[in-house]
């Protein structure tokens, strides 16, 4: 990423902090939080922006978990442990030695316990659904519309590859996006469901991390797309490993 | 086919007002970002405006800020400029054009220019 | 940044292959050719990449890092014109070009 040297800005990442002094003078930006690099060209991941966001508090939200079969980010935010890459570590632990394994989005998906929980593997969520209700409009969105302009918001604005939209469903006012991506889908440079369905809700709420523009401007021929509330669920290529105790 | 076509040009005198009218055809106008540019005599492009298909964003380059307008009228297809204070470097060929990337976080970038106008000319001179 | 960097001239003979570079933008590029000035530029790529489905294959784009790259394979006698980059820059949240690259056909 390269700008005016007096005053360089990451385009893709509000949470930064940026300054001129990469190779040629050229801009480089580092991860509130963190402090690692990020590359502005495209999305930065999901685990240096909670981190990024936990460095500067806000109230922490909550979901509700509507399937035992879906994760829903019920814990709200905790600052993540990221690996070198920027991805969610897969054993999270807070200050009390509370430990957790968590997927690819930093969703938990196992009880809680103590510095002995082992996590062997960073498990991939492969599937997002996330499930919007819009405000109420003159009349129902045209389908087609709703979904050219859905798929279209997720390739132009987060580059994500239009084969990893799985498909949009519309029953009004209910509004819902398949994002899937196995791990054998997603090649060097793809973006990340999880990073594009986080930058998405975050667009959503009002608190785009894009610098510029900011924020979005969603319509269906002309007819603002206004969404008051959103639940994503994410599923994993492995089930998570919850105790009975949790399931009633 | 897609076209735009500039209107309003002509010789104009410093510290007036010009309104330049750019009409499309041949494409959903609603659904694209719109951008001015110009040319002056001799010299490179400038970018100079962009309108998103909304109409609720504009953004303006630092040599006509605070001085241009940019507008559009998505039920006639039809983007305007208001430039005012005119000066002796407003002196150009001001073309219309379209954005290919109305969602994009970049979508005020020139990279997404895919349709131009022939233009219109501009002299501002006493 | 004033506007994006690019090589003032370029100079080739038929058949040869050409590259453009265009740097100092945050984000996509776009590579128009003007054959004369007033006249309105044609555009031969734009978002990067992306060629319009009248310009001849011999055009492409790409982009590395923050560097995009205008390439005609087998350059024409007619292909003879000044190329402009357009870009944006993140440090302004506007579009820019560049000072425009003058190619000749030898």
């Known amino acids: 990423h390269t700008a005016a040297q007096d005053n360089c800005t990451c385009p893709t990442n509000k949470m930064t902090v940026c300054s001129p002094d990469g190779p040629g003078g050229r801009c480089q930006c580092r991860a509130l939080g963190s402090g690692m690099a990020v590359d502005c060209s495209t999305l930065t991941s999901k685990c240096l922006l909670l981190k990024a966001r936990m460095s500067a508090p806000k109230n922490a939200r909550t979901l509700v978990r509507p399937s035992e079969h879906a994760l829903v980010d019920n814990d709200g935010l905790y600052d993540p442990d990221c690996d070198p890459e920027g991805r969610f570590k897969a054993r999270q632990c807070n200050q009390t030695s509370v430990c957790w394994c968590v997927n690819s989005v930093g969703v938990r998906r196992t009880d809680k316990g103590d510095l002995s929980l082992r996590c062997d593997e960073l498990v991939r969520t492969h599937h997002i659904l996330i499930d919007l209700r819009h405000r109420p409009t003159a009349g129902a969105f045209n389908h087609s519309d709703l979904d050219a302009e859905l798929r279209r918001l997720f390739r132009e604005r987060y580059r994500l590859h239009p084969k990893f939209v799985a498909a949009v469903h519309y029953e009004q006012p209910t509004i819902q996006i398949e994002l899937r991506q196995n791990t054998s889908q997603k090649a060097a440079g793809d973006v990340d469901i999880g990073d594009a369905a986080y930058y998405f809700e975050r667009d959503i709420k009002g608190e785009s991390l894009f610098q510029g523009r900011g924020g979005l401007d969603l319509r269906v021929r002309g007819e603002p797309l206004q969404v008051e509330r959103t639940l994503i669920y994410y599923l994993d290529e492995i089930p998570p490993k919850f105790s009975m105790k949790r399931l009633t | 086919a897609v076209t735009l076509d500039e209107s309003g040009g002509g010789l104009q005198t410093p510290g007036g007002g010009l309104s330049l009218v750019c009409k499309a055809s041949?494409?959903?106008?609603?659904?694209?970002?719109m951008f001015w540019v110009r040319q002056a005599p001799g010299k490179g492009l400038e970018w100079v405006a962009v309108?998103?298909?909304?109409?609720?964003?504009?953004n303006y380059a630092p040599a006509v800020k605070g001085r241009a307008t940019i507008s559009r009228d998505n039920g006639q297809s039809t983007l305007r400029l208001q430039l005012n204070n005119l000066r002796a470097e407003d002196t150009g060929t001001y073309y219309c054009?379209?954005?290919?990337?109305?969602?994009?976080?970049?979508?005020?970038?020139?990279?997404?220019?895919?349709?131009w106008g022939h233009g219109t000319e501009v002299i501002v001179s006493s | 940044a004033l506007a994006l960097t690019q090589p003032s001239s370029v100079s080739a003979n038929p058949g040869e292959t050409v590259k453009i570079t265009c740097s100092g933008g945050s984000g996509s590029y776009g590579w128009f050719q003007q054959k004369s000035p007033g006249i309105a530029p044609v555009i031969v790529i734009?978002?990067?990449?992306n060629r319009p489905s009248d310009i001849p294959s011999r055009f492409s784009g790409s982009k590395s890092g923050s560097t995009g790259t205008l390439t005609i394979t087998g350059v024409q006698a007619e292909d003879e014109a000044v190329y402009f980059c357009g870009g944006y820059d993140g440090s302004t949240d506007a579009g820019i070009f560049g000072a425009g690259t003058t190619l000749t056909v030898l």
């Open positions: 734009f978002n990067d990449d």
């Open positions: 309108i998103n298909r909304s109409g609720s964003y504009t």
């Open positions: 054009a379209r954005g290919a990337c109305t969602h994009c976080w970049d979508a005020d970038s020139a990279g997404y220019i895919d349709t």
């Open positions: 041949g494409f959903d106008f609603i659904d694209y970002d």
